[in-house]
């Protein structure tokens, strides 16, 4: 058993049918010695008397808010949460496996640039009685500070018969060094509590591996005289790191017909313009990627050919 | 060419070669399903690798003030990786495919290090750790880790030379 925060304790349990559970001794936080009784949650049933209460915790029915009283007055509370271990593996019931980029991916994180700011998000089908707490650091043995805000509900989607809820959090490395080569990964730890269940989720990454630039901005077409060709031009997104002579992007320009089956013409360039042939009813799209490190491509910015 | 005395390197040549290094490093080890090599007991390998750190002057301001600190750090790294790629980690079993980009990568690392430091001048170089994995699978894992680490290193080097070529070239 360990303390999550003041008066909230986590009991770690091996979880299988007829498991013996864990013996827990609760102590009433009071100088009083006599006439103390104990109850659980909203029940008035007296579970025991005395300054300490010994319980065998086997299932969620044994967890909850234990309260010690004397003469109708509440003396103190202890909230017991359970953390399940099934076949030697901590449970992951609360969050959905996003399966991208690999199985058992519960937290996904992205950064728009090298400033040390990043966003992480996760999914759940649980709608109520859910709290998250996020901590982060650079490295684990001698951790350097990363400050995270509060996790917030950022999206709701209908998936078949169920609703899916997306939560996200923004974090910022306290002393970020955008130009340096990272040697220690960022660690992100999310504590999730649903009703009386505690779970924790972690992710470890380098900022360079989670970079995904915003799409190029100000995408424009300029027809070339007496030609089906057009000059496409665009700019670096505002959110990208500066100076651009140092933090350079590379671009992919695509001409796509109306039908998805039509052949796509693609051009790769380090410049912020390109000359392409504009077909009728086609659209031109441009996306960006770090020029020197193959992290994610941005989403496409698009304009119609006409 | 960069000399320890402090004259400028051939920024544009360095830019071109470092960008080629980036391409080669990624073709030598593309991101295989985002294989997370950090889970595989990283400490002994990549802790000894020279990283371009915050105080090395490789940021735009540091380059403007005095690019020599940064260039020396990059040179150290290039020599380090050049030796690793020439070691039995890469020459031993399992043999690399004949068309593997590792050979080109090795040659380009050497080429860029020579651009930075002509013969007769010597910056101190870092000691190569004695990594001699006994099993072929260990060697394979070590290759992946070294290449992943090299990708990060050459990305920073390429940024330095691109910025230098754009802003510091005479």
């Amino acid at each position: 058993i360990w303390e999550l925060k003041k008066d909230v304790y986590v009991v770690e349990l091996d979880w299988y049918p007829d498991a013996p559970g864990e013996m827990v001794v609760l102590t009433c936080d009071t100088p009083e010695e006599d006439g103390i009784t104990w109850t659980l949650d909203q029940s008035s049933e007296v579970l025991g008397s005395g300054k300490t209460l010994t319980i065998q915790v086997k299932e969620f029915g044994d967890a909850g808010q234990y309260t010690c009283h004397k003469g109708g007055e509440v003396l103190s509370h202890s909230l017991l949460l359970l953390h399940k271990k099934e076949d030697g593996i901590w449970s992951t019931d609360i969050l959905k496996d996003q399966k991208e980029p690999k199985n058992k991916t519960f937290l996904r994180c992205e950064a728009k640039n090298y400033s040390g700011r990043f966003t992480c998000w996760w999914l759940t089908t649980i709608s109520t009685d859910l709290t998250f707490s996020v901590k982060s650091s650079r490295g684990s043995s001698d951790p350097q500070g990363v400050t995270c805000g509060a996790a917030t509900l950022s999206a709701e989607r209908v998936r078949g018969d169920n609703k899916e809820y997306e939560y996200s959090v923004e974090c910022q490395e306290d002393s970020a060094c955008p130009a340096a080569e990272e040697s220690l990964p960022i660690e992100v730890m999310v504590d999730a509590v649903h009703k009386l269940k505690y779970e924790n989720y972690t992710s470890s990454f380098f900022i360079r591996d989670i970079i995904k630039p915003d799409p190029p901005k100000n995408l424009q077409l300029k027809p070339l005289k007496n030609s089906r060709q057009v000059e496409v031009s665009w700019e670096y997104p505002d959110t990208w790191s500066t100076p651009h002579s140092y933090f350079s992007l590379t671009f992919c320009v695509q001409v796509q017909g109306k039908s998805k089956r039509e052949k796509k013409d693609r051009v790769f360039t380090d410049k912020t313009s390109a000359t392409v042939i504009c077909r009728k009813n086609a659209s031109i799209s441009v996306r960006a990627q770090d020029r020197y490190y193959s992290s994610s491509w941005s989403e496409w910015a698009s304009v119609p050919c006409s | 060419r960069a000399v320890p005395g402090g004259s400028s390197p051939a920024w544009t040549q360095c830019q071109q070669l470092s960008q080629k290094l980036c391409t080669l490093a990624w073709s030598a080890h593309p991101l295989v399903g985002h294989m997370d090599l950090r889970e595989e007991g990283d400490e002994e390998t990549t802790n000894d690798v020279p990283h371009i750190q915050c105080g090395d002057g490789c940021d735009p301001q540091g380059l403007r003030d005095n690019s020599q600190f940064c260039l020396q750090r990059i040179h150290q790294g290039l020599i380090f990786y050049e030796k690793l790629l020439g070691s039995d980690i890469f020459t031993g079993e399992p043999s690399l495919l004949p068309d593997s980009p590792v050979g080109q990568l090795h040659a380009s690392l050497l080429g860029l290090s020579q651009l930075l430091q002509p013969e007769g001048h010597h910056w101190e170089t870092q000691q190569i750790p004695s990594l001699s994995p006994s099993q072929p699978w260990q060697r394979l894992l070590l290759r992946f880790k070294i290449l992943r680490s090299l990708q990060a290193f050459v990305a920073v080097a390429a940024r330095v030379f691109a910025h230098g070529a754009a802003t510091l070239s005479p």
Partner: nanobody, 124 residues
């Protein structure tokens, strides 16, 4: 709209059996735990039995252990309560309830969705 609909209640003699059913709709309950609660006239709603999302873990109130069996059909979104050797103290309105998140609880306050209830009366 999420709905839990109980059926199977009725008036029986002491010693008889009844099988209660609960049909769940409006969402997939495959990841939810399900429970049965009962409320006798003038008393609080109390826990009877519950089953986790996969059906492999069940829990019972002391007074019904060995007589009642809870089960579920995940495909049909159904939960059942087989009640044997009924006694007059089993009389009350029986409610089906669901809680998100795989595991069952014994406290009514933890359940997210409730049915309207079905009356069970056991005469002596």
């Amino acid at each position: 709209e999420v709905q839990l609909v109980e059926s199977g209640g009725g008036l029986v003699q002491a010693g008889d059996s009844l099988r209660l059913s609960c049909a769940a709709s409006g969402r997939s309950f495959s990841n939810d735990a399900m429970g049965w609660f009962r409320q006798a006239p003038g008393k609080e709603r109390s826990f009877v039995a519950a089953i986790n999302w996969s059906g492999e873990l069940t829990g019972y109130a002391g007074s019904v252990k060995g007589r009642f069996t809870i089960s579920r059909d995940g495909v049909e979104n159904m939960v059942f309560l087989q009640m044997n050797s009924l006694v007059p103290e089993d009389t009350g309105v029986y409610y089906c309830a669901a809680v998100e998140g795989r595991d069952y609880y014994r406290g009514a306050q933890y359940y997210d969705y409730w049915g309207q209830g079905t009356q069970v009366t056991v005469s002596s």
